[in-house]
């Protein structure tokens, strides 16, 4: 008899090169049988896993999967680091393996100057 | 310098197409990201969509059946088409360049607007 | 959609006073830029994410707030300061402009 459990199909030590300035979207496989879990994205930083609260996500329903996704619209420098997605169900929390964010920065530093560096230049 | 320029018809019939050419100077198109947004005196200022750099394109759900977003990198231009006119289409286009810092995105530059009037 | 609503919609300030303006987020955004615009020109980046002032804009503007309320505050209005001030969200799509807050000069 098939599991009925919530599971996260996300491959332990999964990683992502992208590019700073595009958008990507970062997907949590879910297996799911009757209703839907809660799902969310936290980013950890170091020891603990904090909570994506003002990111856009959405679902897309596939035949045997859904896939919980975390938009980067677009993806900035600061989005580099390790995600893991989480199901609330039936009171249990469970957690995927995380996934790491390579960012390169194409608009790198000495290529343009930075918004802080224009403003100063403007008043020097 | 950072340069957009905005070039359309002015006055479209109801239920035709529009199509506006933005040809952008000081900075390419792989690496900057350029939206359209407009500004109607009903509706204020609205977010049409964006051609990201890598050619990606996302639109606001509300016009996105009716919008099209295209560039040529080469020709420093990008495109908006956008089907089915009615009057309350009428408004400012303007095309906007994006740019990130570490840890946020926002529109930098715009162009000076190109006007467009719906009417028979 | 992220409803951003400015208030108030106009404000008319003398010389030398200081003004606030708010933008309150119908759901949480993670910063807020503003933009200013002239009659007859395109708006002009005026502070992002927040805080931080864009190029050439006088050290009187600042702006502050989280999640879904933020402000724009001129420690002392000068004439030049008369203008239409719109708060913008790149939370989440589609991305949206509030009303806007019409600064005058009284």
């Known amino acids: 008899k098939e599991s009925c459990d919530v599971q996260l199909y996300i491959k332990r030590q999964s990683e992502h090169s992208i590019l700073a300035g595009d958008p990507f979207e970062l997907e949590c496989p879910v297996k799911y049988c009757a209703n839907r879990p809660h799902v969310t994205w936290c980013k950890l930083n170091g020891t603990t896993c904090v909570k994506l609260e003002d990111r856009q996500t959405s679902w897309k329903e596939e035949k045997n999967i859904s896939f919980f996704i975390l938009h980067f619209e677009p993806v900035l420098p600061n989005d580099n680091g390790s995600y893991r997605c989480s199901a609330n169900f039936q009171s249990n929390l469970i957690e995927s393996h995380s996934t790491t964010l390579y960012v390169t920065d194409v608009e790198s530093a000495s290529e343009r100057p930075s918004k802080d560096e224009m403003a100063s230049r403007f008043w020097a | 310098q950072v340069q957009l320029k905005e070039s359309g018809p002015g006055l479209v019939a109801p239920s035709q197409s529009l199509s506006i050419t933005c040809t952008v100077s000081g900075f390419s198109l792989t690496t900057y990201g350029v939206h359209w947004v407009r500004q109607s005196p009903g509706k204020g200022l609205e977010w049409l969509g964006v051609?990201?750099?890598?050619?990606?394109?996302s639109y606001n759900p509300a016009p996105m059946s009716r919008l099209s977003i295209s560039k040529d990198n080469s020709k420093s231009q990008v495109f908006l088409k956008m089907n089915s006119l009615q009057t309350d289409d009428t408004a400012m286009y303007y095309c906007v360049r994006g740019d990130y810092e570490y840890d946020y995105y926002a529109m930098d530059y715009w162009g000076q607007g190109t006007s467009v009037t719906v009417s028979s | 959609q992220i409803v951003l609503s400015q208030s108030p919609a106009i404000l008319s300030a003398s010389p030398g006073e200081k003004v606030t303006m708010t933008c309150r987020a119908s759901s949480s955004v993670s910063y807020m830029h503003w933009y200013q615009q002239k009659p007859g020109s395109s708006p002009k980046p005026w502070i992002y994410?927040?805080?931080n002032l864009a190029s050439g804009v006088p050290a009187r503007f600042s702006g502050s707030g989280s999640g879904t309320s933020y402000s724009l505050t001129i420690s002392r209005m000068e004439a030049e300061d008369a203008a239409t001030y719109y708060c913008?969200?790149?939370?989440?799509?589609?991305?949206?402009f509030g009303g806007g807050t019409k600064l005058e000069i009284k």
């Open positions: 051609m990201w750099p890598g050619g990606r394109t």
């Open positions: 913008h969200q790149w939370s989440s799509n589609p991305y949206t």
């Open positions: 994410a927040t805080s």
